[in-house]
């Protein structure tokens, strides 16, 4: 591997060790639980394609008002702290991807079923954009083996 790649990996590792990604995890868990409560069910029921254009975070206008703006104070506080942490990764997209992977891995045991996992993954992919940052475009968030088509 090229020297700069190895240096980048080491820099990312230390960045990840310094980062506190817990607010991001809390914010996302509150978000998907609140969505389920407000709909009275999983909003991404099997009858809907979770990768349909209207639900694909890559298709959402990143400059439309944040869907989190109207949320409770606790969540917005978590979001603000989360965004501050993610901001540290802005100039290293690959490392931001690793941060998102870490969030996914940390929460995977708490996600109930495939649908909730997919919803969490969608919200997680969209999280950097909600913070006004570019989302990593080539990022695996699979906890288990096997991929999903993205776009």
């Amino acid at each position: 591997r090229q020297q700069w790649e190895l240096q980048g990996d080491r820099r990312c590792q230390s960045q990840l060790e310094r980062a506190n990604l817990r607010p991001c995890e809390q914010h996302l868990m509150q978000k998907i639980q609140r969505d389920e409560d407000s709909y009275g069910r999983d909003p991404y029921s099997p009858s809907q394609d979770p990768y349909s254009p209207s639900q694909d975070p890559d298709r959402r206008d990143p400059y439309s008002p944040s869907p989190y703006d109207r949320r409770g104070a606790g969540s917005s506080q978590h979001q603000e702290r989360c965004c501050n942490e993610l901001n540290e990764f802005e100039n290293n997209q690959r490392c931001m991807c690793e941060a998102l992977q870490q969030i996914m891995e940390n929460q995977s045991d708490r996600l109930q079923g495939r649908q909730q996992e997919q919803q969490f993954k969608r919200e997680l992919r969209n999280l950097p954009q909600q913070c006004g940052l570019r989302a990593p475009q080539r990022c695996d968030l699979e906890v288990e083996s096997g991929g999903r088509d993205r776009y």
């Epitope: 890559d58 690959r94 990593p136 475009q137 080539r138 991929g147």
Partner: antibody, heavy 120, light 107 residues
Framework: EVQLLESGGGLVQPGGSLRLSCAAS????????MSWVRQTPGEGLQWVSA????????YYADSVKGRFTISRDNSKNLLFLQMNSLRAGDTAIYYC?????????????WGQGTRVTVSS | DIQMTQSPSSLSASVGDRVTITCRAS??????LHWYQQKPGKAPNLLIY???TLQSGVPSRFSGSGSGTDFSLTISSLRPEDFAIYYC?????????FGQGTKVDIK
């Protein structure tokens, strides 16, 4: 020296299939996302499909979704594009392209291209 | 999808001329804007990435600038080998999209 060598292009009838391959060398293939980009005289350059370095997550342009499948074999440094239900509009030169390590959204090396012609 | 619009679509210039090509994105893309050069019968070749960073091996007469939605590629003093087609590309969001190209030919 980075090298990408495409193969598998040719003449095929509408509705037919082709499988393109791209042999990579000169870099750590398993560290990089890879893409297929095509070029037609009318449409210019169009990104077609990509996948992450592990191959777990795939991405497609709307125009090929459901018809094309991208895959890779990291043990052999190979990238593939399986093209089914081909249409006249798929006629193009297909390039295999290496994406930058840091996921900044550019193609730092390209193959020489393989020509695909869909015609009856 | 993010639309990329290049101008002009073609231009005629002489060796030694200063040439500027512009590229506009349909929405803000920060500095995720990249430039390629393509010669007849060849694959595109990366010139500039992240709006202004020169790819290794590319002559310093090429430069790029801009951020947000408006970008430009400048060749400070055109050389015979620079006559080609130039493309911009956004890498901010899937699907990555290209401009329609600017053909630079000999006056």
């Amino acid at each position: 020296e980075v090298q990408l060598l495409e193969s598998g292009g040719g003449l095929v009838q509408p509705g037919g299939s082709l499988r393109l391959s791209c042999a990579a060398s000169g870099f750590t293939f398993s560290n990089h996302a890879m893409s297929w980009v095509r070029q037609t005289p009318g449409e210019g350059l169009q990104w077609v499909s990509a996948l992450t370095y592990s191959g777990k997550t795939t991405y497609y342009a709307d125009s090929v979704k459901g018809r094309f499948t991208i895959s890779r074999d990291n043990s052999k440094n190979l990238l593939f594009l399986q093209m089914n239900s081909l249409r006249a509009g798929d006629t193009a030169i297909y390039y295999c392209a290496k994406e930058d390590y840091d996921d900044r959204g550019f193609f730092d090396f390209w193959g020489q291209g393989t020509r695909v012609t869909v015609s009856s | 999808d993010i639309q990329m619009t290049q101008s002009p679509s073609s231009l005629s210039a002489s060796v030694g001329d200063r040439v500027t090509i512009t590229c506009r994105a349909s929405q803000t893309i920060s500095t995720y804007l990249h430039w390629y050069q393509q010669k007849p019968g060849k694959a595109p070749n990366l010139l500039i990435y992240a709006a202004s960073t020169l790819q290794s091996g590319v002559p310093s007469r090429f430069s790029g600038s801009g951020s947000g939605t408006d970008f430009s590629l400048t060749i400070s003093s055109l050389r015979p080998e620079d006559f080609a087609i130039y493309y911009c590309q956004q890498g901010y969001n899937n699907p990555y999209t290209f401009g329609q190209g600017t053909k630079v030919d000999i006056k």
